[in-house]
Structure formats: structure tokens, C-alpha cells
Interface confidence: low
């Protein structure tokens, strides 16, 4: 059989807080358990959810959790069930509510002398008790003829006068909890002797130096006062003002002009009228200086004929919101047609090449007017002027391509050499028209060349065929000074290039012939076996018909090539002592000798106290060092050519002769000895 | 005793940008308005501009308008005048003012020295 | 703008002298809505900031010594010191109070024989 271990009791619960209905069974087999409210079984909800077999409440609901729950226990093999006894929770709340007139019907049938009864909805359980409050400060019962009846909730006036006016709100509170009136009433009983408004002041934007006028009456029996106060609470009176309203005037009938308006004078003004009983009642209204900033500038517009086109007008800021229209030609542009306007936006549909121009937005307010012109421009496709001709250019020489159009905008010019553009450097330039100048021109030049000018309407093109007259000309150039090693075979080549391919012969310079040994073979000169006699100028002579001739002057020199007599040795010196490093060259002319060491030249006349260079070449370091260690390099040169070679030098320390040695123990390296 | 309290000067570049203040105290500050002045070396007054209590209204001599900002914060009694692309001509005392409400200027600060120089 | 002009430039006169300075603006500082004239007078001695002396044209400011007298009307003011003392050596400016931009005049020298 299934036994209730726990069975829920009915409880107190608060509204919004956590609460249980337990139950626990006992029973032979397995059983599942549930809940039901009001004969209906419980879904499990995050606020309403089964905890084992009880039941948890996070946060009770005083509408979805008001009957009767019972836990049922039910053993699903044998069908057999059991049900635990009822229990309901005794739920307590407070809600706010509103303040509302229950009598009479309506606010307009409120009159002074009739009862007024309002009441408080304020709910709750267990019944709440009520407060009630005009304008904050508590009433309490049978005090100036009102009665509260805390039964009903109701405040009733009986009979209602001008003393009664107010902002009425009420409180209640129970076990639970307290809660006040989410909406308030306010009671409004018309007193002659309470200032009410008649005109109330509005708000005024002038421009400066301006005139503005604020109207302001309240009427009331005996007529109520009326006073003006300006943004800080200063007063203003016909008598007594601030410096920045020395130009208001208050008129009797309580209006406050204000003339030759500035800055100083932009602000909150208020209107206060004063009965001779009841509150004062305080209008205000602002002041404000009309305004208009500039307007930003418009890029100038290209557009091409046929299509459609916006261009969109920024307002200037601007106090009150500035106006804006276009105009073109001095004429303010349609709402409607091909060319108009549109909100803030100048329209142009299926644009024509008449369309073109400079239109004006212009805004204003009471503060001015700001214009700012657009120029817009309709592109037209290019037309040619001249197309680029086929050329012939002479190498060396400027040469120049035409490509001249034109268009509105100007047309842009580009130039391509065998399809690559070509970008402005040293040789190339572009000039403003279009043209083309090729600098100097060089053979490699002769190629198709093509230009292409554009606007935003179209571009067309045009090619032409550069070729390029060559110049007669030493390719290359002879060296004009060479030297040929005596008693040995030697040539010297000259060759050239023209529109025609050259003929080239050599002659000395003297106008002598060549020696039988010596022999002219198509530009080049020949030395079988080089003698002394054969020092001297010569000439190439290069011809073509068209081009004439051109002559290059050589002197050749007959030298023994240099060859070295004495190379500097790898050597090895203690620190302290001298260095010696021998070289010596021969050759015709005699040659120089130089010594590099550690990469730089050693320069004979700044070489120091330590080194030393002989008349034959040898180099001297004195009393060296560590630093001294390194590569040096032999260089002998004369005019004809130049040789080096090289050779280490390391400088160790001298090593501390142990007992053993005697005296004339050898080192232990091959040295130089000082 | 009213006192008013200018800082923030200095040597400044060419184009460069500085923002002065001015420290109020012994009176109201928060329903006067303020002025600044400047006098450069040698030379006489020169009205920068003015704000009204609750910064709502603020006027600026015409040629100034576009290099200085002046705002203020209440609750910090501070008047301020931030300067940018200043000038060699720029080089001055600067002093901040309370208006009279009967007219004129009738307290001011020492000044805050400003030398726009490279 | 309106444009401050003060007259002379600098004056030099032996204490107990009365000694008089002009200003003239270049439009009415007259106010129509109090019939006051909307002009200024500060005092500004060596190495300190000017002292507002005079406001409405003629009112002087409270602690300022009545030897200090301001007068004129529309577009024509002076100040007059009716009897100089060694502590009135200052530069002496009149001010538009009247329209922005609030101008001053370029100032007047006393100097103390």
C-alpha cells in the first residue's frame, strides 16, 4: 500500500516570495508522484516546480496559485494511487492603484460647495488601512469637512472649496507590506481670488538687434500681481534692470518688450502671477537669438549629357531651421520638369550639354541668408584637333608626337609605348595639349606609339609609328689613351653605326702610313708584335654618304706590363718590435707602388711616426700591435696597368722563456727578428 | 571677498593649441557672466567674448570667433578659454571678468601670461 | 563694430591739478529702454589689471573716491579727476558697454609731474 510520509498543509504565503507544499511517500514498489491544482495536474514552470515529491514555489502568484493543491502518488505497475489532503495557501499582497473621482462623474462638473469624493485603489490582503495626503502633507479624519472612510477607501469633501485644491494621493498598509497611489489627483477648485492664466507667453525667436514681445496676463478678483524674472532670477521692472535687459519695457497689461535683442538677452523668461490667495503661478518662455551659419563649399560637379544627376544641398545650422531653394542664372529652379528642385536636392534628369553652369543653393532665416555657388560642368566625348602622325626622329635629338583634342572638361592625355603606359620620367614628358616630347631620342625608340584622351563622357585614340634616323656614331666610342704591352701581339677595335652601315679606317694622326706589321682589318688595327715606334696618335676615320664622316683620336702607349721583383711575405712579429714588409715592381713606366692595410689606402703623408714607406716600396711598421694584425696589399700601377698582391701579417705576444730554455732556444714561430 | 583665479599660460608654438582657466570665488558664480580680456605687451584692452550663467549664450569678438572656445563648468566655479592656431599676435595677458549686472566689468583676475613664440 | 576713440593719448599734470579725458564712440551708447548711457571707465595702474571706476557713463563704482566724475551722453563722454593725487598715475580706458562686440577705447596716459 502507498503511504503519505508528509502530506502538504494549507500555510501563509507572501506574494512574490518562496513558499513549499511538501509531501513524501512511502510505498512497497516504485511509484512516480504529481500535483494537482484544482483537480488539473501542475506543469513545472522556472517560477512553480516539483522538488523530489514536493512542490516549490520561487515566488508565489496570488492569482495562478489561489485553490487547492493536492500530491498524488500513483504505483504505475498495479494502477494503484493514492492522494494526499487538500491544501491552499492563504496568499498575502498589497497593489497599488490609482486615485480616481468617484463622485461626480466628471472633473467639469467639480463647482465650489458640491461634494467632491475620491477614492483610493489600493487592494490587498488581509485589507489594508488607508492614508490619505493633499500636496504631501497627511489628512486625518473629521478635520476641515472631509471624512476618510477607511472601510470604502474614500475621501469624501463635503462641502469642496478653493481650500481643498490640491495634488491628492494616498498610502496603505497591511501585514504584508505598504503601497502608495501610482497615479495621483489633482484637485483643481476655481477661487476668484487665485491668479489664473488668461495669455500665456510664447516662445519667440528674433533675429538681432530685433524687437521681441512676450504677452502674459492672469485675471483673478481682487486683480493679481504680475511679475517678469529673466533666466537667473533677476527681476525686471521699468525701474530696475540688468545691463543686458536695459531695453525691456513691461507694459501694464503685463506684456515684456524687448528691443535691439542680443545675445545678452537670449534666455528663460518667466511670468509670475500672484493672486491674493493661492500659489503663484510661474509661465516661462524663451528667448532665442535667430542664427545662421555659413555653409560648407561644394566641390565642382562633372557630370555626362544623358544622365541623371543630384546634387544635394546642406542646410546651414541655423535658428529658426533656415529655408532653402536653388536658383540657376538668377531664376529660382521648379519643383517639377528636367532641371529642378527637390527637398533640399537640385535635380538634373537627361542632362544636356546646356545644363551646364553654376547653380546656387541659397538658405535663409531671420537671421540672414548664406549662399554657396556649385559649378557644374557636362563632359563631352573628345574630338581630335590633330592625331598623332607616323614620324620619322633623329636619334640624339627632341622629338616630338601631337595628339591635340578637345572636350569639356580638357580632356586628359595619356601616351603608350607598345602598349605600356608611358609614366613622365627624364626622356618623356607630357605637355598640357597633349603633346609628346621624347627627349633624346635613342634608337630603341622607333616602335608604335599610341595616345588616348578621355573626359568622364569617352575617350578615343589614335597610334602612330615612330622611326628613328640614326646618327652616325662610334659604337662605342674608342678609348681615346690605351697601352699595348711591348714585344707582344695587340689590337684595337673601332667600329660604328649609321643610316647606312659605315666604312672605317685607321690613319696616324700625323697622316703617316701604317707600318707593314701593322694592319687595318675592317675597323680593326692589327700589331703583329708591338714595338716601341708603335706609340703614337692614331685616327678612326667612320663614313657613310649620307652622313659624312666622323674621326676618333687614340694615343697609344707601349709599355712593359708591371711584374713584381719582391712579394710581401706572410709574417708573424712579436708586439714591441718592427715589421718589415718588402715589395718591389718593375715595368715601363716605372711603376708606383701603394699599400693598402686593413682596407683603407695608406696614405704616405699621414702615415704617422710608426710607419714608413722605402723609395723601393717596402712598408715599415714600427713598434706594432695587435691592431696591427691584417691583410696588406702591394699595389703597383703606372699608366698602362696595375698589379697587387698581398700578404698577412699577425703580431703575437712574446712568449715568457720557461727554465728549461736556454738561451738560444729558437722561438716557436717563424719571425722577423729587430 | 571676491577673487578670480586665471592659469594655464605659457610659451606655446605657432599653431599650436592652449586652454586657460579661471578659478571663481566669493561670489555666485553660477548666475554671473564672465568675460575674458587680453592685453598684449605695451598695448590696451581687448574684449575676447562673453558667456552667459548657463552657457547658453556665448558671443565672441568677430575676429576671434574661430581660434577661442569659451565654456565654463558651475559646479567647478572654472571659466575656460581654449586657444588653437595661435599666433605671434596671440602673445598677451589674458584676463577673465565678472560683468557687472549695473554695467562694466567689476572684479578681474591678474592675468595669465601667454607668448606664442618658436 | 563700434569704434572707441580716447583723447589724448597721454597727459602729464601736477598732483592736485584737475585734469579732463575724452572718449567718442563711434555710435549713440544711448539705451532707450532706460535712458541710461551703456559706457564704462576702468583704471589700470603699472603691473595690475584694470579697476572698473565708472559704469552708466556717470554712476560711480562703490570705494571708487568722488574726485572721480564721469559724464557725457550719446557719443561724447569724459572722465574728470577734479584734484590728481600721486596714486592716480595709471592708463585710463573707456569701454562700449552698449553692443556687442564690447570695444574698448586705445586708453589715456596720466603722468604725475
Known amino acids: 500500500a502507498i503511504v503519505f510520509i508528509k502530506q502538504p498543509s494549507s500555510q501563509d504565503a507572501l506574494q512574490g516570495r518562496r513558499a513549499l507544499l511538501r509531501c513524501e511517500v512511502e510505498a512497497p514498489g516504485p511509484v512516480h508522484v504529481y500535483w494537482l491544482l484544482d483537480g488539473a495536474p501542475v506543469q513545472d514552470t522556472e517560477r512553480r516546480f516539483a522538488q523530489g515529491s514536493s512542490l516549490s514555489f520561487a515566488a508565489v502568484d496570488r492569482l495562478q496559485d489561489s485553490g487547492t493543491f493536492q500530491c498524488v502518488a500513483r504505483d504505475d505497475v498495479t494502477g494503484e494511487e493514492a492522494r494526499s489532503a487538500n491544501a491552499s495557501f492563504n496568499i498575502k499582497w498589497i497593489e497599488a492603484g490609482p486615485v480616481v473621482l468617484k463622485h461626480p462623474a466628471s472633473e467639469a462638473e467639480i463647482q465650489p460647495q458640491t461634494q467632491v469624493t475620491l477614492r483610493c485603489h489600493i487592494d490587498g490582503h488581509p485589507r489594508p488601512t488607508y492614508q490619505w495626503f493633499r500636496d504631501g502633507t497627511p489628512l486625518s479624519d473629521g478635520q476641515s469637512n472631509h471624512t476618510v472612510s477607511s472601510k470604502e477607501r474614500n475621501l469624501t469633501l463635503r462641502p469642496a472649496g478653493p481650500e481643498h485644491s490640491g495634488l491628492y494621493s494616498c498610502c496603505a498598509h497591511s501585514a504584508f507590506g505598504q503601497a502608495c497611489s501610482s497615479q495621483n489627483f489633482t484637485l483643481s477648485i476655481a477661487d476668484e481670488s487665485f491668479a489664473r492664466v488668461v495669455l500665456a507667453p510664447q516662445d519667440v525667436v528674433v533675429a538681432r538687434y530685433e524687437e521681441a514681445m512676450f504677452h502674459c496676463q492672469f485675471s483673478a478678483q481682487p486683480p493679481p500681481s504680475l511679475q517678469w524674472l529673466f533666466e537667473d532670477e533677476t527681476p525686471i521692472t521699468n525701474r530696475s534692470r540688468p545691463p543686458h535687459l536695459r531695453r525691456a519695457t513691461v507694459f501694464a497689461n503685463g506684456s515684456l518688450l524687448l528691443t535691439q535683442v542680443r545675445p545678452r538677452n537670449a534666455g528663460i523668461y518667466r511670468c509670475i502671477g500672484q493672486g491674493q490667495r493661492g500659489p503663484p503661478i510661474i509661465l516661462e518662455a524663451t528667448l532665442h537669438l535667430a542664427e545662421i551659419e555659413d555653409m560648407p563649399l561644394f566641390e565642382p560637379r562633372v557630370f555626362t549629357a544623358g544622365s541623371e544627376e543630384r546634387v544635394t544641398c546642406l542646410p546651414p545650422k541655423g535658428l529658426p531651421e533656415p529655408s532653402v531653394w536653388w536658383e540657376h542664372a538668377g531664376v529660382r529652379l521648379p519643383t517639377h520638369g528636367r532641371v529642378y528642385q527637390k527637398g533640399h536636392e537640385l535635380v538634373l534628369a537627361n542632362i544636356a550639354e546646356s545644363d551646364a553652369g553654376v547653380y546656387t543653393c541659397h538658405a535663409a532665416n531671420l537671421a540672414g541668408q548664406r549662399r554657396q555657388d556649385v559649378n557644374i560642368t557636362v563632359a563631352t566625348v573628345p574630338s581630335w584637333l590633330k592625331k598623332p602622325q607616323d614620324s620619322q626622329l633623329e636619334e640624339g635629338k627632341p622629338g616630338y608626337l601631337d595628339c591635340l583634342t578637345q572636350a569639356t572638361p580638357k580632356p586628359t592625355v595619356v601616351w603608350y609605348r607598345n602598349q605600356m603606359l608611358i609614366s613622365e620620367d627624364s626622356r618623356f614628358e607630357v605637355f598640357k595639349n597633349g603633346t609628346l616630347r621624347i627627349n633624346s631620342v635613342e634608337v630603341y625608340d622607333g616602335t608604335w606609339y599610341r595616345c588616348m584622351s578621355s573626359t568622364p563622357a569617352g575617350s578615343i585614340e589614335a597610334q602612330a609609328r615612330v622611326q628613328v634616323l640614326e646618327k652616325l656614331k662610334f659604337t662605342p666610342p674608342p678609348q681615346p689613351q690605351q697601352c699595348m704591352e711591348f714585344d707582344k701581339e695587340a689590337t684595337v677595335p673601332c667600329s660604328a653605326t649609321g643610316r647606312e652601315k659605315p666604312t672605317i679606317k685607321w690613319e696616324r694622326a700625323d697622316g703617316s702610313s701604317l707600318p707593314e706589321w701593322v694592319t687595318d682589318n675592317a675597323g680593326t688595327l692589327h700589331f703583329a708584335r708591338v714595338t716601341r715606334d708603335d706609340a703614337g696618335n692614331y685616327t678612326c676615320i667612320a663614313s657613310n654618304g649620307p652622313q659624312g664622316q666622323i674621326r676618333a683620336h687614340v694615343q697609344l702607349t707601349v709599355a712593359v706590363f708591371i711584374t713584381f721583383k719582391v712579394e710581401p711575405e706572410r709574417t708573424t712579429v712579436y708586439q714591441g718590435h718592427t715589421a718589415l714588409l718588402q715589395c718591389e715592381a718593375q715595368g715601363d713606366p716605372k711603376p708606383l707602388i701603394q699599400w693598402k692595410g686593413k682596407d683603407r689606402i695608406l696614405d704616405p703623408t699621414k702615415l704617422g711616426p710608426r710607419m714608413h714607406i722605402f723609395q723601393n716600396g717596402s712598408l715599415v711598421i714600427h713598434d706594432v700591435a695587435p691592431e696591427d694584425s691584417g691583410r696588406y696589399t702591394c699595389i703597383a700601377g703606372n699608366s698602362c696597368n696595375i698589379k697587387h698582391t698581398e700578404a698577412p701579417l699577425y703580431v703575437v705576444d712574446k712568449p715568457v722563456p720557461e727554465e728549461s730554455e736556454g738561451p738560444g732556444s729558437p722561438p716557436p714561430y717563424k719571425m722577423i727578428q729587430t | 571677498e571676491v577673487k578670480l583665479l586665471e592659469s594655464g599660460g605659457g610659451l606655446v608654438q605657432p599653431g599650436g593649441s592652449l586652454k586657460l582657466s579661471c578659478a571663481a570665488s566669493?561670489?555666485?558664480?553660477?548666475?554671473?557672466?564672465m568675460s575674458w580680456v587680453r592685453q598684449a605687451p605695451g598695448k590696451g584692452l581687448e574684449w575676447i567674448g562673453e558667456i552667459n550663467p548657463d552657457s547658453r549664450t556665448i558671443n565672441y569678438a568677430p575676429s576671434l570667433k574661430d581660434k577661442f572656445i569659451i565654456s565654463r563648468e558651475n559646479a567647478k566655479n572654472t571659466l575656460y578659454l581654449q586657444m588653437s592656431k595661435v599666433r605671434s599676435e596671440d602673445t598677451a595677458l589674458y584676463y577673465c571678468a565678472r560683468w557687472d549686472y549695473d554695467g562694466g566689468m567689476d572684479y578681474w583676475g591678474q592675468g595669465t601670461s601667454v607668448t606664442v613664440s618658436s | 563694430d563700434i569704434v572707441m576713440t580716447q583723447s589724448p593719448s597721454s597727459l602729464s599734470v601736477s598732483a592736485g591739478e584737475k585734469v579732463t579725458m575724452s572718449c567718442k564712440s563711434s555710435q549713440s551708447l544711448l539705451n532707450g529702454g532706460n535712458q541710461q548711457n551703456s559706457l564704462a571707465w576702468y583704471q589700470q595702474k603699472p603691473g595690475q589689471p584694470p579697476k572698473l571706476l565708472i559704469y552708466g557713463a556717470s554712476t560711480r563704482e562703490s570705494g571708487v573716491p568722488d574726485r572721480f566724475t564721469g559724464s557725457g551722453s550719446g557719443t561724447d563722454f569724459a572722465l574728470t579727476i577734479s584734484s590728481v593725487q600721486a596714486e592716480d598715475l595709471a592708463v585710463y580706458y573707456c569701454q562700449n558697454d552698449h553692443t556687442y562686440p564690447y570695444t574698448f577705447g586705445g586708453g589715456t596716459e596720466l603722468e604725475i609731474k
Open positions: 566669493g561670489f555666485d558664480f553660477s548666475k554671473d557672466w
